[in-house]
């Protein structure tokens, strides 16, 4: 998978100061690369826009949990 290895890393330099409504969020990914200045979570919204968030904040953790449960629940 050379493409994945060489893919540019998106880093977060600032975090949102806002608590985002979980209903607006579609997915997330964790940023843990040593190339980035800080660990972060990038949420993708339902309209495919990305937002940097602080993984230490409770609302961010709760939102990740919510999205995890959504993906684990089979859609009927």
């Amino acid at each position: 998978q050379p493409d994945a290895i060489n893919a540019p890393v998106t880093c977060c330099y600032n975090f949102t100061n806002r608590k985002i409504s979980v209903q607006r969020l579609a997915s997330y990914r964790r940023i843990t690369s040593s190339k980035c200045p800080k660990e972060a979570v990038i949420f993708k919204t339902i309209v495919a826009k990305e937002i940097c968030a602080d993984p230490k904040q409770k609302w961010v953790q709760d939102s990740m949990d919510h999205l995890d449960k959504q993906t684990q629940t089979p859609k009927t």
């Epitope: 977060c12 600032n14 100061n17 985002i20 209903q23 607006r24 937002i51």
Partner: antibody, heavy 122, light 107 residues
């Protein structure tokens, strides 16, 4: 249809008051921050104020602090701007706008009302 | 407050021209920069956010680039409907601020 419909502009004397309204439809209003942006005749854009989803957090540009109050009623899908102690320099078209979060900052605008003209003159 | 200086303040161009508009911030705004198009008597329309992300539904002839103090909006091939005023806006910190605009006129 996703839209913002504005009302409440008009002519007011210096020192007077006016309340602007913005009715949202086609999206879940309570999930978004909202802003007011103004534009003096023939001039550029100036952000005025914004408000958090549940109304608990508000920010204002210095020139309107203590005179303008932003508020919202999520049950009515409506945003408001109460303008008191109006001055000639507040004359502008006022736009309401949906306020989004970016990758590295908060507060850009992806949906706008058509604007309403406020004229402050004696 | 962060000041945004747009240049030029106006320009004349022809249909098909490549047009480059610039926006300089008085201090760093990371990639927290948006571009809008406004036509007379109308509300602004979002074109670009996060300095280089194209808003849904906006033609691909529009592109944004830059970081730090200097940003550009490029229109690769100017179309008749692109004659308008363009504003940049920073959302790195309060107060949110706009540039003074660049008016793109028909040559």
């Amino acid at each position: 249809e996703v839209q913002l419909v504005q009302s409440g502009g008009g002519l007011v004397q210096p020192g007077g008051s006016l309340r602007l309204s913005c009715a949202a439809s086609g999206f879940t209003f309570s999930h978004y921050w909202m802003s007011w942006v103004r534009q003096a005749p023939g001039k550029g854009l100036e952000w005025v104020a914004n408000i958090e989803q549940d109304g608990s957090e508000k920010y204002y540009v210095d020139s309107v602090k203590g005179r303008f109050t932003i508020s919202r009623d999520n049950a009515k899908n409506s945003l408001y701007l109460q303008m008191n102690s109006l001055r000639a320099e507040d004359t502008a078209v006022y736009f309401c706008a949906r306020d989004l979060e970016g990758l590295h900052g908060d507060g850009y605008f992806d949906l706008w009302g058509r604007g309403t003209l406020v004229t402050v003159s004696s | 407050a962060i000041q945004l200086t747009q240049s030029p303040s106006s320009l004349s161009a022809s249909v098909g021209d490549r047009v480059i508009l610039t926006c300089r911030a008085s201090q760093g705004v990371s990639s927290a920069l948006a571009w809008y198009q406004q036509k007379p008597g109308k509300a602004p329309k979002l074109l670009i956010y996060d300095a280089s992300s194209l808003e849904s539904g906006v033609p691909s002839r529009f592109s944004g680039s830059g970081s730090g103090p200097d940003f550009t909006l490029t229109i690769s091939s100017l179309q008749p409907e692109d004659f308008a005023t363009y504003f940049c806006q920073q959302f790195n910190s309060y107060p949110l601020t706009f540039g003074g605009g660049t008016k793109v006129e028909i040559k």
